[in-house]
């Protein structure tokens, strides 16, 4: 057979669909690999071919498009299941070809079972809502293209297992779910069930997403350095270990990159010769504010080290801050018999 550009198994697009529900799967070639769309390919005389490998099998086989009620069909660059069955799980390949050109890609499709409370192994998208930020909406995802605009589906929303009716601050509005004022108590999994008719049959689409209530931009502040601070002095003798934590609180900011770093005498620790180690840890609050701690450690500090400037820096989309640690050499305690005695006039 002639050479075919094989994009391999595209595991980035791990497609999961619920059992016994319609699924429409677009060939990834046109979305992610080729610079032209299906219409262009079709008008250039290219043909799109589908085949699959069943779960735990190595044999590629054609897809059976002659099942009762057209359970599996193809329409342009979309593979349709009306509905899926559990044993449809496998690796699917779409191949675009003519006599001189060939390109193909495979992708995994997993048909997933759900229980009566919509729990399943499905990986859920996360939608972030700002805490106490006024009306915010989530939309029932991935339902476009399943039915024409002339069809008016019924949509039912659930939080966890419970149908959303007479909730204090959550109101179903068709495909949208409105949160009047998002609170931590609104964290959880929300499911929309879309029911629509097609050719005398009734189909259900189930879509679950996780709502996570996060810090509001109106509460966001530049990074706050809690340590080092003016109230703490690192007083050490040469030979002792010097440990200085830099602890920084970052407000949650969508898509912000939070950074913490130390400078010693104005240089990054990597650029100086002293034996310094830095360990970082990160923790998050329930609204995804972030506390980053970088502990600067010098195992055996020298008197030179105790004269250096140690500055902690932090940066987020809200701004940049810096704070110097107060480091000094401990004055040795006087030996009573000699120094103090002299002070009291002893000879």
């Amino acid at each position: 057979s002639e050479r075919c550009d094989d994009w391999g198994l595209d595991t980035m697009r791990q497609i999961q669909v619920f059992e016994d529900e319609p699924a429409r799967i677009k060939c990834p070639l046109f979305e992610h690999f080729l610079k032209f769309n299906y219409s262009t390919a079709h008008s250039a005389g290219l043909t799109l071919i589908w085949y699959w490998t069943r779960q735990d099998r190595d044999l590629e086989e054609p897809i059976n498009f002659r099942l009762p009620e057209n359970r599996i069909s193809k329409e342009k660059d979309v593979l349709w299941f009306r509905p899926t069955l559990l044993n449809d799980t496998g690796n699917y390949t779409c191949m675009l070809r003519n006599t001189t050109y060939c390109s193909k890609v495979a992708f995994p499709l997993e048909v997933v079972q759900k229980d009566s409370c919509f729990n399943s192994p499905m990986k859920l998208p996360v939608h972030k809502l700002y805490i106490e930020y006024g009306i915010q909406r989530i939309t029932c995802p991935n339902v476009d293209g399943y039915f024409p605009s002339s069809v008016k589906p019924t949509i039912t929303w659930y939080m966890g297992c419970y149908k959303i009716q007479n909730f204090n601050n959550v109101i179903p509005e068709g495909m949208n779910l409105s949160f009047l004022i998002a609170l931590i108590s609104n964290n959880g999994n929300y499911t929309c069930v879309v029911t629509y008719p097609e050719n005398g049959r009734t189909f259900h689409l189930t879509r679950t997403l996780t709502v996570k209530v996060v810090g509001s931009p109106k509460n966001a502040v530049p990074p706050v350095i809690h340590s080092p601070n003016d109230h703490v002095v690192y007083e050490k003798e040469p030979g002792e270990e010097l440990l200085i934590p830099c602890t920084v609180y970052f407000s949650f900011l969508m898509d912000s990159r939070n950074e913490v770093w130390w400078t010693i005498d104005g240089k990054k620790p990597d650029d100086i010769t002293i034996d310094v180690t830095i360990n970082e840890s990160i923790s998050h609050s329930r609204t995804e504010d972030e506390t980053r701690t970088q502990i600067l450690s010098i195992k055996k500090v020298t008197s030179e080290d105790l004269k250096r400037s140690y500055v902690c820096h932090a940066r987020s989309a809200k701004g940049e801050v810096a704070k110097a640690a107060k480091v000094k050499q401990k004055v040795p305690a006087p030996r009573y018999t000699v120094e103090l005695a002299c002070g009291f006039g002893a000879t």
Epitope: N219, V221, V224, I225, H226, S227, H231, V232, V233, Y234, E235, L243, I244, P245, T247, Y249, S251, S281, S283, D289, T291, T293, I295
Partner: antibody, heavy 123, light 112 residues
Framework: EVQLVQSGAEVKKPGASVKVSCKAS????????MNWVRQAPGQGLEWVGQ????????YYAQKFQGRVTMTVDTSTSTVYMELSSLRSEDTAVYYC????????????????WGQGTLVTVSS | DIQLTQSPSSLSASVGDRATITCRAS??????????MHWYQQKPGKAPKLLIK???DLESGVPSRFSGSGSGTDFTLTISSVQPEDFATYYC??????????FGQGTKLEIK
């Protein structure tokens, strides 16, 4: 999970000293202030002082200056509070409590508390 | 030193009632953007538990029936609908600058 576990109850005579320990786990010990708060029987809460484990820096309430010493052992993530020249009015439950970090630069709250250590001063 | 005065010193309420406790500071404990006033709940024989920090921010895991408000010198803790487990003593606490922390004298919430 953050935990503060304190040493057991103590009975002391007036004029003696007592040393109470508080072992921390579940967080980066050296980076949070540790406070000591006491509560006499049937009374309210009274702040004694605080220590920053990374440096050993201490601050004490005026009332306890000269009688209280707070120390730290970073190898065991333990803070100690020693109170000397005990008198009967020092009979109280002594709590260690961690200072939190938040989006503000000061004015910290106490977010985790030990279970308390009862110190009884009696002749 | 800043003094904190809580009122009332005791409060009787029934399950489902709204309960309000106030705390007045002898001088302002607010600065640009925040107030360093916190509220704790203490049950007999137990350590205090942080409920509200910085005047109005609910601590993680605390039921939303608890709320805090106020700024400057006057602060309020409100329980919108008292539950059986809410009968306890409540303390306000300010931490205005190191090294001085002060607590209010406490308010005992009792069953009516």
């Amino acid at each position: 999970e953050v935990q503060l576990v304190q040493s057991g109850a103590e009975v002391k005579k007036p004029g003696a000293s007592v040393k109470v320990s508080c072992k921390a786990s579940g967080y980066i010990f050296i980076t949070y202030w540790m406070n000591w708060v006491r509560q006499a029987p049937g009374q309210g809460l009274e702040w004694v002082g605080q220590i920053f484990p990374a440096s050993g820096t201490t601050y004490y309430a005026q009332k306890f200056q000269g009688r209280v010493t707070m120390t730290v052992d970073t190898s065991t993530s333990t803070v100690y509070m020693e109170l000397s020249s005990l008198r009967s009015e020092d009979t109280a439950v002594y709590y260690c409590a961690r200072t939190d970090f938040y989006r503000y630069e000061g004015g910290y709250a106490l977010d985790y508390w030990g279970q308390g250590t009862l110190v009884t001063v009696s002749s | 030193d800043i003094q904190l005065t809580q009122s009332p010193s005791s409060l009787s309420a029934s399950v489902g009632d709204r309960a309000t406790i106030t705390c007045r500071a002898s001088q302002s404990v607010s600065t640009s953007g925040y107030s360093s006033m916190h509220w704790y709940q203490q049950k007999p024989g137990k350590a205090p538990k942080l409920l509200i920090k910085y005047a109005s921010d609910l601590e993680s895991g605390v039921p939303s029936r608890f709320s805090g408000s106020g700024s400057g010198t006057d602060f309020t803790l409100t329980i919108s609908s008292v539950q059986p487990e809410d009968f306890a003593t409540y303390y306000c606490h300010h931490s205005w600058g190191i090294p001085m922390y002060t607590f209010g004298q406490g308010t005992k919430l009792e069953i009516k």
